[in-house]
């Protein structure tokens, strides 16, 4: 049985131009974490594996840096890097857990930070 | 220890399409990448695109889009590559090469030889 | 696409004697995160596949031998081989593999005077 959660940044907004870290964190199991992979809608940003580290796609090389930990962070933002994100943990024995986080980049200096949210 | 064992050679004609396969074993399959590179006879070496069996991302070059499909059997450990559409100048050793992040194309199958002729 | 290229394309060497060879990028192939350039050299031995000889421009692959060496960074790179030996014939080439597509340089063929 599933018993973990993962917890999540939740939304967020940043200014366009910027940088944002998004952070999953899984909580409420002893499961082993074999890898995360990032996603963008269904475009994969990068992968952090236990063994052989991180993998950042070579299509978001010039944006995308691996941490801090397992989260990732998001730079030069643009409005097209509006959407939803996916930390997708792959663990052992519970299987995978999936956390959303919603990015809304602003023109604007108006961008704060939403509340944390789970998902179980 | 590592081992990437593609299908045997083919002849095919101009219109039709071909399937590689591609075997992996003594690593985990679901871990790297696999590549699929060709050369053509006397030439250098063209990327054609990517997949990763953990989670079935692709990515093609464009030169190929359309035309190239590839695809990835965790149960066996195996990737294919379809290229459809065969020209002559399709005629090539097609090569699956395994990939991660940094540390480039460590292991390369023996490649297979495509001939395109009517 | 980001373009790779070699020089010279042959390259005569005497047994014992140290050889290079050139491989510039029309893009810099440094990743600014782990500051590590992502470029290849490979070795494609006669009638057989390519071998990966070294990764992030410098780094040896497990089992190469240590006559080969790798270096440069950004947009220009060397693969030097201190001494020739008459197993290190082929063609010799660099890769980018910083963004898709990746994309290989023409080739260097080493062959013994």
């Known amino acids: 049985m599933m018993t973990g959660t993962i917890e999540t940044t939740g939304n967020i907004s940043a200014e366009k131009g910027g940088s944002i870290i998004l952070q999953c964190h899984l909580s409420s199991t002893t499961a082993q974490v074999t890898q995360v992979n990032w996603e963008q809608q269904d475009q994969l940003l990068a992968i952090c594996n236990a063994d052989l580290g991180w993998h950042i796609s070579p299509s978001f090389k010039d944006r995308v840096a691996p941490g801090p930990g397992l989260g990732l962070t998001l730079q030069s933002l643009t409005v097209n890097d509006t959407g939803e994100y996916f930390c997708i943990y792959h663990t052992y024995p519970d299987g995978t857990y999936t956390g959303r986080i919603f990015l809304e980049v602003l023109e604007s200096s108006v961008a704060e930070h939403g509340a944390r949210f789970q998902i179980p | 220890q590592v081992q990437l064992v593609q299908s045997g050679a083919e002849v095919k004609k101009p219109g039709a399409s071909v399937k590689v396969s591609c075997k992996a074993s003594g690593y985990t399959f679901t871990n790297y990448w696999i590549l699929w590179i060709r050369q053509a006879p006397g030439q250098g070496l063209e990327w054609m695109g990517d997949?990763?069996?953990?989670?079935?991302?692709?990515n093609y070059n464009e030169k190929f889009q359309g035309r190239v499909t590839l695809t990835a059997d965790t149960s066996s450990s195996t990737a294919y590559m379809e290229l459809s559409r065969l020209r002559s100048d399709d005629t090539a050793v097609y090569y699956c090469?395994?990939?991660?992040?940094?540390?480039?194309?460590?292991?390369w199958g023996q490649g297979t030889l495509v001939t395109v002729s009517s | 696409d980001i373009v790779m290229t070699q020089s010279p394309l042959s390259l005569p060497v005497t047994p014992g004697e140290p050889a290079s060879i050139s491989c510039r990028s029309s893009?810099?192939?440094?990743?600014?995160?782990?500051?590590?350039?992502?470029l290849a050299w490979y070795l494609q031995k006669p009638g057989q596949s390519p071998q990966l000889l070294i990764y992030w421009a410098s780094t040896g692959e497990s089992g190469v031998p240590d006559r080969f060496s790798g270096s440069g960074s950004g947009t220009d790179f060397t693969l030097k081989i201190s001494r020739v030996e008459a197993e290190d014939v082929g063609v010799y080439y660099c890769?980018?593999?910083?963004?898709?597509?990746?994309?290989f340089g023409q080739g260097t063929k080493l062959e013994i005077k």
């Open positions: 890769q980018q593999y910083y963004s898709y597509p990746f994309t």
């Open positions: 893009q810099s192939l440094l990743y600014n995160s782990n500051q590590k350039n992502y």
């Open positions: 997949i990763y069996p953990g989670g079935h991302y692709t």
């Open positions: 090469t395994r990939y991660y992040g940094p540390y480039a194309m460590d292991y």
